[in-house]
């Protein structure tokens, strides 16, 4: 009742290894690591078979097959590459995601090496089987911003993905009667999330109370240049917009306001996140020249009162931006306590401008960015929020223009993303 | 068209309480407040307080906070106030109106009288 | 609390002439951000309900007619008629909307 002598199958071994087997021997028969034993195409671990009273084997010896962890996951925002020959997705073949730059860049500088492991599943030494996170990058447009040195006169036209963080928003108020419109600017922070002053959003009331316009009357154009040309634009809805809860209309303390869209953005030359500050409360330095961009009003000769009769028939079609110093605070507090009027810059704003006027953002330009190149993380960073200005037409001499302070609220900012500090440290400035 | 339709006359006990509504018709209810005024007869206008339909959020005029109790029926696109411990002072032509004014209900009587 | 104060309480005039009315606030009721003064002029004829004539200080609601026209910033407000008509026989209110809202005591506009 001798059993015929076994062959492990390639790949793997028998157990016992006996010369002879008999009557009611078991063998065990098991894979080399990195492979799996095959049955009747099943796959298992091990698999018995016995020595039967008539000298046969209750089963045939199954094969060993290498272990295949088939295709990897799809990164979001990212790509995979093979660096094993023929794209074998088997044992200890390798793979790497990336992130698709220059628009997303991987959360912790992770390698995004995967190996296929013994278990059949892709890993990674710091994430094990988790996906990489392509997060998006900030503050580096594709084309280059001009050089800072040479001050510019007044407005002029920005080349397409020079401000690829700008966007336009457009509020369309049908609950009132008559409908009421108006548009303003605002900056975008992450593919979901764009950054504006409050008073942007805030419902146009006949009274002073504050109440967000609702969502649904929120339109945001990313990758915009020309107004009169929005088919290469993205264009989104509002899911949330989100007023600071201190805003005061009676003295713009707080202006500050966030639009999560209804669906995140592509990112690409023309969309991309500007970055956020650290939490500062000194704001940016004196002298410090930042750049802002809107595509308010461009004619320096054009009274408040006109603007504000003639509608939008005074607005720029092509993207304007103006290069602006920061003016110390207390210069700025000392020119508007001399006007008449309540005009209290507060510690929660800055000023920007030339003394002897002639740049300067204007109605329209509302809740635009005031971006500052940061030196030693070579990305640029929103530091005012277009805010307010004097009762003078744009850019009056002596009268500076007022941003909010973006440093002050960079909690606030993160809290309302609801993204912890950790997950986004590639967005702040470093 | 937008149509702000009050309920009828109300002829109401000393100390007892009574509970005025205002149907709004004919544009976004939820994104208007509505205001109640009151009007003693040969007197001038008084305003009571605002109701925000969108959260229910109310504002009063200090004078009122303890006499009137603003609320709303967003599934019917109705205003209500109810007026609490009435006297004779209370006795008066109360109007709601929205979209910051620009339509006004046509008024209820209140008579306050034993 | 603000204190709106209207002058004169009533007048008399001939239907053709040119009528103004004043209206004071106890507080500046101009908010330099937003360059608008938080007042509304309203119209109450006889028996009806008080209807919105000019917010934002001179901003006239659609329908209004034209001859009606209000002025004034700060404190001091003026509501003009052009040119009366025998449909213009009212109470006309103002009312400050800058905190909360408080009507004056409104001027009653006769004709002769």
């Known amino acids: 009742n001798e059993c015929p002598e076994l062959q492990p199958p390639v790949h793997g071994k028998i157990e016992p290894s006996q010369a002879k087997y008999f009557f009611k021997d078991q063998v065990l028969v098991s894979c080399d690591t990195g492979y799996k034993v095959l049955k009747d195409n099943v796959e298992m671990d091990t698999f018995q078979i016995e020595c039967l009273k008539d000298g046969t084997w209750s089963n045939k010896i199954p094969t060993c097959k290498i272990v295949d962890c088939r295709a990897p996951g799809e990164l979001e925002h990212g790509l995979i590459t093979f660096s094993t020959r023929n794209n074998l997705t088997t044992y200890k073949s390798e793979i790497k995601y990336s992130c698709q730059e220059p628009y997303y860049k991987m959360l912790n500088n992770n390698t995004g090496i995967y190996t296929c492991s013994a278990q059949g599943v892709w890993m990674n030494k710091v994430l094990g089987r988790s996906l990489p996170t392509c997060l998006p990058e900030c503050g580096q447009p594709s084309r280059s911003l001009p050089s800072l040195v040479k001050r510019i006169i007044g407005g002029r036209n920005a080349e397409p993905g020079l401000f690829p963080w700008q966007a336009l928003i457009v509020v369309e108020d049908t609950s009132r009667v008559p409908n009421d419109k108006w548009f303003g600017s605002g900056a975008l922070l992450s593919a979901s999330w764009i950054l504006t002053a409050a008073h942007v959003l805030r419902s146009q009331r006949r009274d002073t109370t504050v109440i967000p316009v609702s969502k649904e009357h929120v339109t945001v154009y990313l990758g915009l240049h020309d107004v009169r040309d929005k088919s290469g634009a993205v264009n989104s809805s509002a899911a949330r917009v989100v007023l600071h809860p201190d805003f005061n209309i009676q003295n713009y303390n707080h202006d500050i306001a966030l639009v999560q869209l209804q669906e995140p953005v592509p990112l690409g030359p023309h969309v991309m996140p500007v970055c956020l500050p650290r939490l500062e409360p000194e704001g940016p330095a004196p002298h410090m020249l930042g750049l802002v961009a809107g595509w308010g009003i461009s004619n320096p000769n054009v009274t408040v009162d006109e603007i504000i009769s003639s509608g939008t028939r005074t607005l720029s079609d092509v993207l304007q931006y103006v290069k602006l110093p920061v003016v110390p605070h207390a210069e700025c507090k000392t020119s508007y306590e001399s006007r008449s009027g309540n005009y209290s810059v507060t510690e929660n704003m800055f000023c920007a401008g030339y003394y002897e006027g002639g740049k300067d953002t204007c109605l329209g330009d509302s809740g635009g960015a005031f971006v500052i190149f940061d030196d030693l993380s070579q990305r640029w960073v929103v530091q005012g929020l277009v805010s307010w200005g004097g009762p003078e037409e744009c850019g009056s001499k002596q009268v500076y223009g007022v941003y909010t302070k973006v440093s002050n609220y960079v909690d606030w900012v993160w809290e309302q993303m609801g993204l912890p500090q950790s997950v986004v440290e590639p967005q702040v400035e470093r | 068209q937008v149509q702000l339709k009050q309920s009828g006359p109300e002829l109401v006990k000393p100390g007892a309480s009574v509970k005025l509504s205002c149907k709004a018709s004919g544009y976004t209810f939820t994104s208007n407040d509505i205001n109640w005024v009151k009007q003693r007869p040969g007197q001038g206008l008084e305003w009571i307080g605002w109701?925000?339909?969108?959260?229910?959020?109310?504002k009063y005029n200090e004078k009122f906070t303890d006499k009137a109790t603003l609320t709303v029926d967003v599934s019917s696109s109705t205003a209500f106030m109810e007026l609490h411990r009435l006297t004779s002072e209370d006795s008066a032509v109360y109007f709601c109106s929205s979209v910051e004014d620009s339509y006004w209900g046509q008024g209820t009587l209140v008579t306050v009288s034993s | 609390d603000i204190v709106m104060t209207q002058s004169p309480s009533s007048l008399a005039v001939s239907a053709g002439e040119k009528v103004t009315m004043s209206c004071k606030s106890s507080?500046?009721?101009?908010?330099?951000?937003?360059?608008?003064?938080?007042l509304s002029w309203y119209q109450q004829k006889p028996g009806q309900s008080p209807k919105l004539l000019i917010y934002w200080a001179s901003t006239r609601e659609s329908g209004v007619p034209d001859r009606f026209t209000g002025s004034g910033s700060g404190t001091d407000f003026t509501l003009t008629i052009s040119s009366v008509q025998a449909e213009d026989l009212a109470v006309y209110y103002c009312k400050q909307s800058y905190n909360l809202y408080t009507f004056g005591g409104g001027t009653k506009l006769e004709i002769k």
């Open positions: 109701i925000y339909p969108r959260d229910g959020t109310t």
């Open positions: 507080q500046s009721l101009l908010i330099s951000r937003t360059r608008k003064n938080y």
